[in-house]
Interface confidence: low
């Protein structure tokens, strides 16, 4: 006999935790579980912790198709293999003015004023077997040590003379000492190169493009360069177009038009000349005079300005 609400195995789905239901018969179903789950309805989270990878006392916490390691305080990372820096967490870990150095699974102290031991509270010399040159300071590290050199000494064991003492780097360059061979290394300031920073960098030959804009001429100088600008341009790199109209060169109420490297005056009726300074009686055409002014401007533009002229561009 039929029923108004016949049983459909997958409606609603009995599968939990994201499992997919598949009808296998009139009254039967099968759950296809997401990774990490098992059981007839995917109700069980598979334990991912057997033979886990947590180390250094890390506790395995099962997740969905994964696990996490809950690490002890001195370890971190996915498997508790990465060291925590206790020196950051415990500012007073070392007593008696000792310096804290981080170690795998803990920390160590580099002590001062005769103090020694794990926390600088006892008299054990951590650097007893170090071979730092006398006069240098030994700092204990994880399974090793480092030597802090006095002035004039360099190298991993402070056994080399510091080549920077003689100030071999010129032009205010920064001098560093190679810890392996004691040789100096100069970090040159802008504009200089070479082992001693004595060679000038020719900025004009350096790049494919001219550092001076608007066809300015690049002139190399010691440690730098400067630009000789075409008429009508100014600025350290000839980047500014000078507004020649700024000085109001046109007379008799004429209109000034700024041009590249020059200007043109559009005269009021009855005036002519480059600056509209000439009064005319007859109604002559002023066009020829305008062309003349432009011709002058064009010829002047062919020459370089000898020096920088600092104009204000508006």
């Amino acid at each position: 006999a039929g029923s108004d609400n016949p049983y459909v195995p997958c409606a609603p789905s009995p599968c939990v935790n994201g499992g997919t239901c598949r009808q296998t018969g009139d009254f039967t179903f099968e759950c296809s579980c997401l990774p990490g789950f098992e059981g007839s309805t995917c109700e069980r989270n598979i334990d991912d912790c057997p033979n886990h990878r947590c180390q250094n006392g890390g506790v395995c916490v099962d997740g969905v198709n994964t696990y996490n390691c809950r690490c002890p305080p001195q370890w971190t990372g996915q498997f508790c293999t990465e060291d925590v820096d206790e020196c950051l967490l415990q500012p007073n870990a070392c007593q008696n003015g000792g310096t804290c150095t981080n170690r795998n699974g803990g920390y160590g102290c580099v002590c001062v004023n005769g103090w020694s031991g794990d926390d600088c509270s006892e008299n054990i010399d951590d650097c007893a077997f170090a071979s730092c040159t006398p006069g240098s300071t030994c700092i204990d590290r994880v399974a090793s040590f480092s030597c802090m050199c006095p002035e004039g000494k360099a190298g991993l064991l402070c056994h080399l003379d510091d080549a920077c003492i003689s100030n071999p780097c010129h032009k205010g360059a920064l001098c560093d000492t190679n810890p392996l061979n004691g040789h100096y290394i100069c970090t040159c300031p802008q504009g200089y190169k070479g082992a001693d920073c004595t060679e000038d960098v020719d900025e004009c030959a350096m790049t494919n493009s001219n550092p001076c804009e608007h066809a300015g001429k690049c002139v190399n100088t010691d440690g730098a360069f400067h630009c000789e600008c075409l008429k009508g341009y100014a600025g350290p790199r000839c980047e500014m177009d000078i507004n020649e109209c700024h000085s109001d060169p046109c007379q008799n109420d004429a209109t000034c038009l700024d041009k590249i490297g020059g200007f043109t005056c559009l005269c009021m009726p009855g005036f002519k000349g480059v600056h509209c300074e000439i009064e005319i009686n007859e109604g002559n055409s002023g066009l020829n005079d305008i062309f003349e002014a432009q011709k002058i401007e064009w010829h002047e533009n062919l020459y370089f300005q000898g020096h920088h002229h600092h104009h204000h561009h508006h």
Epitope: Q55, N56, T66, T81, G105, A143
Partner: antibody, heavy 117, light 112 residues
Amino acid sequence: QVQLQQSGAELAKSGSSVKISCKASGYTFSNYVIHWIKQTTGQAPEWTGYIIPGSGGTKFNEKFKGKATLTVDKSSTTAYMQLSSLTPVDTAVYYCARDGAGSFTYWGQGTLVTVSS
Amino acid sequence: DVLMTQTPVSLPVSLGGQVSISCRSSQSLVHSDGNTYLHWFLQKPGQSPQLLIYRISNRFSGVPDRFSGSGSGTDFTLKISRVEPEDLGVYYCLQSTHFPDTFGGGTKVEIK
């Protein structure tokens, strides 16, 4: 510095077993997992399994369960992998590698195992 | 197992040129701890693989800065900015987010 020194090449017959070693130095042996990785000529490496030296706990790639046995000797800081019931498909270079940063940070030079039928 | 797919399989390069190798995973490599455990290795002919980049973009000690790693989720890239002769060999990606750890098939970088 960290070093993993592996034993020399092995030539074995089908059905037999071999035991290869990986001597660790330059770090605290108990603090880091030792992995074993198989690489057949011209193929990508394949993770086989690992051992936690501190506890002796192991975990294997399903593919290698029953094939490999991993052990350590903490006193000599040496890890071992024994391969049993050898067949020609076990012919490969086997590497040991140290764990760190969730990856294999340092590798041994590899041990070539050749299985003849 | 997570499938790691590397492209291209072979990459002819010119010395001084730039190289880009892709690695795709069949599922997201973001671990529940927030980290992404995707790493890159180089295996030079006749040598063991060596770690170059760990957790997507961190250069391992001693690895030159011409090597860089990027990506997220399932898509990752290794770039070499200026190829040098010692960079030739097979590059592998590795995931260690999901058990078991799985390597990509490799990309052979060779001279054109």
